[in-house]
């Protein structure tokens, strides 16, 4: 099951966000999160993940995309894209599973 | 300290929504190490898991309540919210925030029981 | 969905007796996301043990969890009368999160 978290050998990571403690982290997964906000411009934040992989399964929308990779610093270059507005019917930020 | 605040009606009727707001203190709840969960006890009952929501918005929600139930998140107020709609009396419970990290649920809210009733 | 079943549904002890709670997996879990409870009447659960065997800040240390795969235990060596409550354990990091049913250790 890819989505059963576990504590098996830790991967180093680049951690660029306001919560990072320093330029790396260490954690099961590396992670990238674009997330735009209403009125804001999109932030991108890198760094660790431990639980809840199925965050990496979701799909893209408007307003968040998450990126997992499992390499040592694999997260460094990576740049992500929101999706294109969707139509009012949809909803966005939709339960992922 | 990381405290954590439920609030909103105690009492809902049958059909309607049930809203309450966790208020979250003593940490930011845009951290990406948390998890921000709700969970119900109905009376004399276990504990059921409702959803979580991650501080970009994704949410994650019980299958069994997954067409009812909406998770919000307001990270400049550092509060999510619980949307639980055409509730009836097996929804009344007390409803919990809680914190969820790699060590668990580490921290909760005291809970605030909401009835359902005309 | 993982079904966590514990037993018994109560126990009573008297203190100073050693308390073992079982919980058992429907399928092999990761022992890393296995989580431990104890709720008293009219309060919110408190985290007593996470990642099967490692305690939360503050809990004594007569408290201590075990297991792995499909069987967890949490086990109190010597009762104190503040440890007589409902216990609950828990699998967490991975959607759905789940809660076994609850062990009620009562006074004998």
């Known amino acids: 099951d890819p989505v059963k978290p576990s504590r098996g050998p830790l991967v180093t990571c680049t951690c660029e966000s306001p919560h990072c403690k320093g330029p790396t982290c260490r954690g099961a997964w590396c992670t990238v999160v674009l997330v735009r906000e209403e009125g804001r411009h999109p932030q991108e934040h890198r760094g660790c993940g431990n639980l809840h992989r199925e965050l990496c399964r979701g799909r893209p929308t408007e307003f968040v995309n998450h990126y997992c990779c499992d390499s040592h610093l694999c997260n460094h270059n990576v740049s992500l894209v929101l999706e294109a507005t969707q139509p009012p019917s949809e909803q966005p930020g939709t339960d992922g599973q | 300290q990381v405290q954590l605040q439920e609030s909103g009606p105690g009492l809902v009727k049958p059909s309607q929504t049930l809203s309450l707001t966790c208020t979250v203190s003593?940490?930011?709840?845009?951290?990406?190490?948390?998890?921000w969960n709700w969970i119900r006890q109905h009376p004399g009952k276990g504990l059921e898991w409702i959803g979580y929501?991650?501080?970009?918005?994704?949410?994650y929600y019980n299958p069994s309540l997954k067409s009812r139930v909406t998770i919000s998140v307001d990270t400049s107020k550092n509060q999510f919210s619980l949307k639980l709609s055409s509730v009836t009396a097996a929804d009344t419970a007390v409803y919990y925030c809680?914190?969820?990290?790699?060590?668990?649920?580490?921290?909760w809210g005291q809970g605030t029981l909401v009835t359902v009733s005309s | 969905e993982i079904v966590l079943t514990q037993s018994p549904g109560t126990l009573s002890l008297s203190p100073g007796e050693r308390a073992t709670l079982s919980c058992r997996a429907s399928?092999?879990?990761?022992?890393?996301?296995l989580a431990w409870y104890q709720q008293k009447p009219g309060q919110a659960p408190r985290l007593l043990i996470y990642?099967?065997?490692s305690r939360a800040t503050g809990i004594p240390d007569r408290f201590s969890g075990s297991g792995s795969g499909t069987d967890f235990t949490l086990t109190i060596s010597r009762l104190e009368p503040e440890d007589f409550a409902v216990y609950y354990c828990?699998?967490?990091?991975?959607?759905?999160?789940?809660f076994g049913q609850g062990t009620r250790l009562e006074i004998k």
């Open positions: 809680a914190r969820e990290s790699v060590a668990g649920f580490d921290y």
């Open positions: 399928q092999s879990v990761s022992s890393s996301y």
């Open positions: 828990q699998v967490y990091g991975s959607v759905p999160i789940t």
């Open positions: 990642g099967t065997s």
């Open positions: 929501i991650y501080y970009s918005g994704s949410t």
């Open positions: 003593g940490g930011s709840i845009s951290s990406g190490e948390y998890y």
